[in-house]
Interface confidence: medium
């Protein structure tokens, strides 16, 4: 309409570029049920991982163990909040737990996201050092370095998630009976800049919490695969089975991570781009409606990690079996592994006892014969 033109025949209807947004219809008990399942599997699985790691003697722990433990702690602290989110969703978005738990549980979602991603990146880098550069970087993989790296990643995760702790609040937004747990930008932003804050935080969380770590992980696994492929070309035919399994597990690790988190970050990014590119209404509405399910899938990652990072290790299975055995009959004494040593720690990066190429304390000696033969990713 032109400036100064009469708009008496304008009916007040938004033009077609504005969508017919509607209240999001929750899927009844589906999302709450998934949340509760993730809670049950996540607490059990991650608890088991922590038990397996910490029951081992300190000397037998490897640099990767600290990342494994951190990953389990991150997932565990997050999944314990899932009953709250299950309740919130089931009550059609009515938060009965107060502002403190709204802030805390929201904060833990993002701490978990960052810490998990950083732990996975740490693990990937640890594998890269173990397989691709075992001699040059042996010192980097000492437990002390792992502890420092873990401390840094936790501090970083805690800081990056801080805006959520600050901005999350509860409110009866319309003076109705329902209380929502939501992001309130009013304390840091003017009305006109609220969307900029939302976009800014959204873009930064996707960049720091997905794009950069995933790029690092892919790079690590690319070089790992290259090294393995190069080595196995010189090996006998029976090496092919190991190569396939090793590569397939690596692919499973990366792909699972991507499958769980990609939809969340992709949909979020597409939605934010919509304000610039003006998607068709149907697509915009589709993004809005699918986002809760994408969030749900990303939460599922917190219970999958124990299965992917632990259950691929036969020693972890052995530890689990010994625990179940001990739980039933006390195992007629201390549990022993088939090799005669005490059930060792679960490590996604190293074997547990000194192998043929191991030096003092189980660290690899400076001999690059078969550097990854100690990696527990090679499942016999």
């Amino acid at each position: 309409m032109e400036e100064g033109g009469d708009f008496d025949n304008y009916y007040g209807a938004d033009n077609q570029s504005e969508c017919e947004y509607t209240d999001w219809k929750s899927s009844g008990a589906l999302i709450p049920a998934i949340y509760m399942l993730v809670f049950l599997l996540g607490t059990t699985g991650n608890g088991l991982v922590l038990w397996t790691v910490f029951r081992s003697s300190r000397e037998k722990r490897r640099s990767a163990d600290i990342f494994i433990a951190s990953l389990a702690v991150a997932d565990l602290t997050f999944v314990v909040t899932l009953p709250l989110w299950a309740t919130y969703t089931y009550r059609d978005y009515d938060w009965p737990f107060g502002t403190f738990f709204c802030k805390l549980s929201s904060y833990l979602i993002f701490v978990n996201m960052y810490a998990s991603v950083f732990c996975l990146t740490g693990l990937s880098f640890d594998r890269y050092l173990a397989i691709v550069r075992p001699v040059a970087n042996a010192r980097l993989r000492l437990r002390v370095s792992g502890a420092v790296a873990t401390a840094v990643l936790w501090v970083l995760a805690a800081l990056l998630a801080m805006p959520v702790m600050v901005l999350r609040t509860t409110g009866d937004l319309e003076n109705t009976t329902k209380v929502q747990c939501y992001m309130d930008y009013s304390m840091v932003a003017t009305v006109s800049s609220e969307w900029a804050w939302e976009v800014g935080l959204g873009v930064s969380s996707t960049t720091v919490g997905f794009v950069v770590p995933f790029t690092i992980m892919l790079t690590c696994y690319f070089f790992i695969a290259q090294t393995i492929a190069g080595h196995f070309r010189k090996e006998r035919i029976e090496g092919l089975r190991k190569r396939r399994r090793l590569l397939s597990i690596i692919v499973v690790l990366v792909v699972t991570f991507a499958l769980c988190w990609m939809p969340y970050h992709l949909v979020k990014t597409l939605y934010m781009l919509g304000s610039l590119l003006h998607w068709p209404c149907d697509f915009d509405l589709f993004l809005m409606n699918i986002f809760p399910y994408c969030t749900c899938i990303s939460y599922v990652n917190s219970c999958l990690n124990p299965f992917l990072y632990a259950f691929f290790d036969p020693r972890f299975r052995q530890a689990c079996t010994s625990m179940l055995c001990c739980g039933q009959s006390r195992c007629a004494g201390t549990s022993h592994s088939s090799s005669g040593e005490k059930s060792a720690s679960y490590s996604s990066g190293h074997s547990q006892g000194p192998g043929p190429n191991m030096g003092k304390g189980g660290e690899q000696m400076h001999e690059k014969s078969i550097p990854y033969s100690q990696e527990t990713l090679v499942v016999d």
Epitope: Y11, G12, A13, D14, E20, Y21, T22, D23, W24, S26, Y88, T89, D92, Y93, D94, L173, E174, N175, T176, K178, Q180, C181, Y182, M183, S186, V191, S192, E198, K268, Y271, L287, M288, F291, P292
Partner: antibody, heavy 129, light 107 residues
Framework: EVQLVESGGGLVQPGGSLRLSCAAS????????MSWVRQVPGKGLEWVAN????????YSVDSVKGRFTISRDNAKNSLYLQMNSLRAEDTAVYYC??????????????????????WGQGTTVTVSS | DIQMTQSPSSLSVSVGDRVTITCRAS??????LGWYQQKPGKAPKRLIY???SLQSGVPSRFSGSGSGTEFTLTISGLQPEDFATYYC?????????FGQGTKVEIK
């Protein structure tokens, strides 16, 4: 063309009843909250009541609670206002209006009311003995 | 209930003038305020929602600002068709409440 057409107004005695209807066209009626707003001749506007898309949530001003009932029939693209125990102060032009909300992408369940963007031409209700 | 107080209740202005109408809320309503224009015998029309967002199809000479309890509607360069009554509406909480209106008349 997006349109709302009210009907059912007229003259009624105090204590009497009246049912106002609003026929919607040109948009997906079932996707929107709907409101009734009234205006005493020569006076200001007063919001009366509104109803959620599926009818599961209804809100109204205290002065009409227990007397007026808002309802809808999505199959007929119609909004209704059942007015009982009418009083002289209920005399007004009654407008049917479409509510607009903004929805939080991240926080499902959070909605921001953006007022009424489409209005009908109004129907007059006169309560007099 | 939140009370909305509009000022002035009426004003006489000339075509081309800049008009400012103020609306005060009895308590903080964030940015949950809209502005409506009504001409005699016609239904109201939404001009502004969420304090400053312009309704599509509305000329850009209309603008809104404010936050919390004090809000303003500004018409920069009044046109003949802008002579009408203007209402503010708080859409922060139930019940929704309108201001008493500001009548803009020709001087």
């Amino acid at each position: 063309e997006v349109q709302l057409v009210e009907s059912g107004g007229g003259l009624v005695q105090p204590g009497g009843s009246l049912r106002l209807s609003c026929a919607a066209s040109g948009f997906t009626f079932s996707s929107f909250w709907m409101s009734w707003v009234r205006q005493v001749p020569g006076k200001g506007l007063e919001w009366v009541a509104n109803i959620k898309q599926d009818g599961s949530e209804k809100y109204s001003v205290d002065s009409v609670k227990g007397r007026f009932t808002i309802s809808r029939d999505n199959a007929k693209n119609s909004l209704y206002l059942q007015m009982n125990s009418l009083r002289a102060e209920d005399t007004a032009v009654y407008y049917c209006a479409r509510d607009r909300f903004g929805y939080s992408f991240y926080d499902k369940g959070v909605r921001y009311y953006y007022g009424m963007d489409v209005w009908g031409q109004g129907t007059t209700v006169t309560v007099s003995s | 209930d939140i009370q909305m107080t509009q000022s002035p209740s009426s004003l006489s202005v000339s075509v081309g003038d800049r008009v400012t109408i103020t609306c005060r809320a009895s308590q903080g309503i964030r940015n949950d305020l809209g502005w409506y224009q009504q001409k005699p015998g016609k239904a109201p029309k939404r001009l502004i929602y969420a304090t400053s967002s312009l309704q599509s199809g509305v000329p850009s000479r209309f603008s809104g600002s404010g936050s919390g309890t004090e809000f303003t509607l500004t018409i920069s360069g009044l046109q003949p068709e802008d002579f009408a009554t203007y209402y503010c509406l708080q859409h922060n909480s139930y019940p929704r409440t309108f201001g008493q209106g500001t009548k803009v008349e020709i001087k």
